[in-house]
């Protein structure tokens, strides 16, 4: 359960303070100096890849 | 208790090197970005740099951009700050603390400080 | 980040009013305490919401470009240098300060 007043991201996903919303972290692979990829806490998994066609 | 650690301080001459470290205790370190905060004699708050909780993304103060360099090794629970060609401006006392980012990145606990002095 | 006033000289018991004007508009805001020889201490978090175990005669409050911290009653614990922060454009930065000091 979240503390009243804290930001209201889901896992996942992390609050921007410039843009004031929360923003999907998978996205900080790309750029990971965009200001919400502070709060991510682990680095997302890898997209699934099957290993044959 | 949830707890930071820190060690590292120290005298260094002018272009010197020097490496603080932070351990800590009582939570899950991977689950919390980190920074770093100064603070010069009798002076205010500084904000130097911080690290999300992977590691993978990094952020500077203009002002140690290029010279120092946040890092974290999260299987021994520890934060670090390598600063490099050091500065008389660079004395402080600085902090480690936990940021929490559902508290829009307040910092909610704080190292107890090390003193890092840059003389000749 | 700018604090007013720099110094605020008040007696215990007396309400306490401390601002800080952001140079840019800013969502959220932080607020610290620290008292001599010691780390900061987490007061407010997200403009209002006051951290564990923080009192409720402390208050944040409001938006844009003003925000204010509001202690209604001084305690003496509560003479102190108080630090507003934001996180703006992937930078952290705290405010000059605010001393409030015993009268």
């Known amino acids: 359960e979240q503390a009243p007043g804290t930001a209201p991201c889901s896992r996942g996903s992390s609050w921007s303070a410039d843009l004031d919303k929360c923003m999907d972290c998978a996205s900080c692979r790309a750029r990971p100096h965009s200001d919400f990829c502070l709060g991510c806490a682990a680095a997302p998994p890898a997209p699934f890849r099957l290993l044959w066609p | 208790q949830v707890q930071l650690v820190q060690s590292g301080g120290g005298l260094v001459k002018p272009g010197g090197s020097l490496r603080l470290s932070c351990a800590a205790s009582g939570f899950t370190f991977t689950s919390y970005a980190m920074s770093w905060v100064r603070q010069a004699p009798g002076k205010g708050l500084e904000w130097v740099s911080a690290i999300s909780g992977s590691g993978g993304s990094t952020y500077y103060a203009d002002s140690v951009k290029g010279r120092f360099t946040i890092s974290r090794d999260n299987p021994k629970n520890t934060l670090y700050l390598q600063m490099n060609s050091l500065r008389a401006e660079d004395t402080a006392v600085y902090y480690c603390?936990?940021?929490?980012?559902?508290?829009?990145?307040?910092?909610?606990?704080w190292g107890q400080g090390t003193l890092v002095t840059v003389s000749s | 980040l700018t604090q007013s006033p720099g110094t605020l000289s008040l007696s215990p018991g007396e309400r306490a009013t401390l601002s800080c004007r952001a140079s840019q508009s800013v969502s959220r805001l932080t607020w610290y305490q620290q008292k001599p020889g010691q780390a900061p201490r987490l007061l407010i978090y997200g403009t209002s919401s006051r951290a564990t175990g923080i009192p409720n005669r402390f208050s944040g409050s409001g938006s844009g470009t003003d925000f204010t911290l509001t202690i209604t009653r001084l305690e003496p614990e509560d003479f102190a240098v108080y630090y507003c922060?934001?996180?703006?454009?992937?930078?952290?930065?705290f405010g000059g300060g605010t001393k409030v000091e015993i009268k």
């Open positions: 922060q934001q996180f703006r454009n992937s930078l952290l930065t």
């Open positions: 603390a936990r940021v929490r980012a559902n508290y829009y990145y307040g910092m909610d606990v």
